[in-house]
Interface confidence: low
């Protein structure tokens, strides 16, 4: 779970150990604030749960890529 230390800065202190199926993911946001101890990705699941993940891991990168492709509408 992400922690809001001093709103509006949200940080992750631990990452999930489990790979989450992309079908369960609704969106993500990157955490890059220098106020946080580590860079992170926070996934929001389809049931609105927020999960901290390591952006250096392949499954995280691939999940972000999948979500990006869902939201990018091709130009006509």
């Amino acid at each position: 779970q992400p922690d809001a230390i001093n709103a509006p800065v949200t940080c992750c202190y631990n990452f999930t150990n489990r790979k989450i199926s992309v079908q369960r993911l609704a969106s993500y946001r990157r955490i890059t604030s220098s106020k946080c101890p580590k860079e992170a990705v926070i996934f929001k699941t389809i049931v609105a749960k927020e999960i901290c993940a390591d952006p250096k891991q392949k499954w995280v990168q691939d999940s972000m890529d999948h979500l990006d492709k869902q939201t990018q509408t091709p130009k006509t």
């Epitope: 952006p55 250096k56 891991q57 392949k58 990168q61 972000m64 890529d65 990006d68 990018q72 130009k75």
Partner: antibody
Framework: QVQLVQSGAEVKKPGSSVKVSCKAS????????MHWVRQAPGQGLEWMGR????????KFDPKFQGRVTITADTSTSTAYMELSSLRSEDTAVYYC??????????WGQGTTVTVSS | DIQMTQSPSSLSASVGDRVTITCKAT??????LAWYQQKPGKAPKLLIH???SLEHGVPSRFSGSGSGTDYTLTISSLQPEDFATYYC?????????FGGGTKVEIK
């Protein structure tokens, strides 16, 4: 901290092959992608390809397809790039890099490959 | 393949100057852009990713902006250690491609 240490400089004859190694420390290579980028003297950067060390799935720039082989040994945390049918235009510094989502946050020190008859 | 055009190819500036480097993609890269700094004989160093996100440890005088096909790297107040070559790189799709580089020299 993350460190990528590459093998030493090589001088090769045209038509031969070269194999460059990249040993990683401070990270689990099976959790990330390892990429290879080259830079000819006085020129810009050119992405060659990458490997997923976990399943050995590779992706290449089509211009290198068939001539480059990228492998990885997770037991030694080492990635390898082999380039065959060398020509003078392949004279360059070859870098390995840890890929994060398609960009590169840690780089090896580079390996100079000179192709000369 | 997505082509990246960087300009200018070189520029002369003084310490304290504001420097702007631009990068144009041949198609929308959806902010999938990174900037690197390279000094002679050294490997490139990641400065910015995702068009605007500063890599940890990179001074705040570096900033990135842009969207769609057009992106900019700005150095707000050039320091002696900033004289180097800068490259943009798209990571929208493989093959990942770099701009031709911008050499920042001392005036």
């Amino acid at each position: 901290q993350v460190q990528l240490v590459q093998s030493g400089a090589e001088v090769k004859k045209p038509g031969s092959s070269v194999k460059v190694s990249c040993k990683a420390s401070g990270l689990t290579i099976s959790h990330t992608y390892m990429h290879w980028v080259r830079q000819a003297p006085g020129q810009g950067l050119e992405w060659m390809g990458r490997i997923d060390p976990d399943n050995h799935n590779t992706k290449f720039d089509p211009k290198f397809q068939g001539r480059v082989t990228i492998t990885a040994d997770t037991s030694t945390s080492t990635a390898y790039m082999e380039l065959s049918s060398l020509r003078s235009e392949d004279t360059a510094v070859y870098y390995c890099a840890r890929g994060v989502f398609g960009f590169f946050d840690h780089w090896g020190q580079g390996t100079t490959v000179t192709v000369s008859s | 393949d997505i082509q990246m055009t960087q300009s200018p190819s070189s520029l002369s500036a003084s310490v304290g100057d504001r420097v702007t480097i631009t990068c144009k993609a041949t198609e929308d890269i959806y902010n999938r852009l990174a900037w690197y700094q390279q000094k002679p004989g050294k490997a490139p160093k990641l400065l910015i990713h995702g068009a605007t996100s500063l890599e940890h440890g990179v001074p705040s005088r570096f900033s990135g902006s842009g969207s769609g096909t057009d992106y900019t790297l700005t150095i707000s107040s050039l320091q002696p250690e900033d004289f180097a070559t800068y490259y943009c790189q798209q990571f929208r799709s493989a093959p990942y491609t770099f701009g031709g580089g911008t050499k920042v020299e001392i005036k």
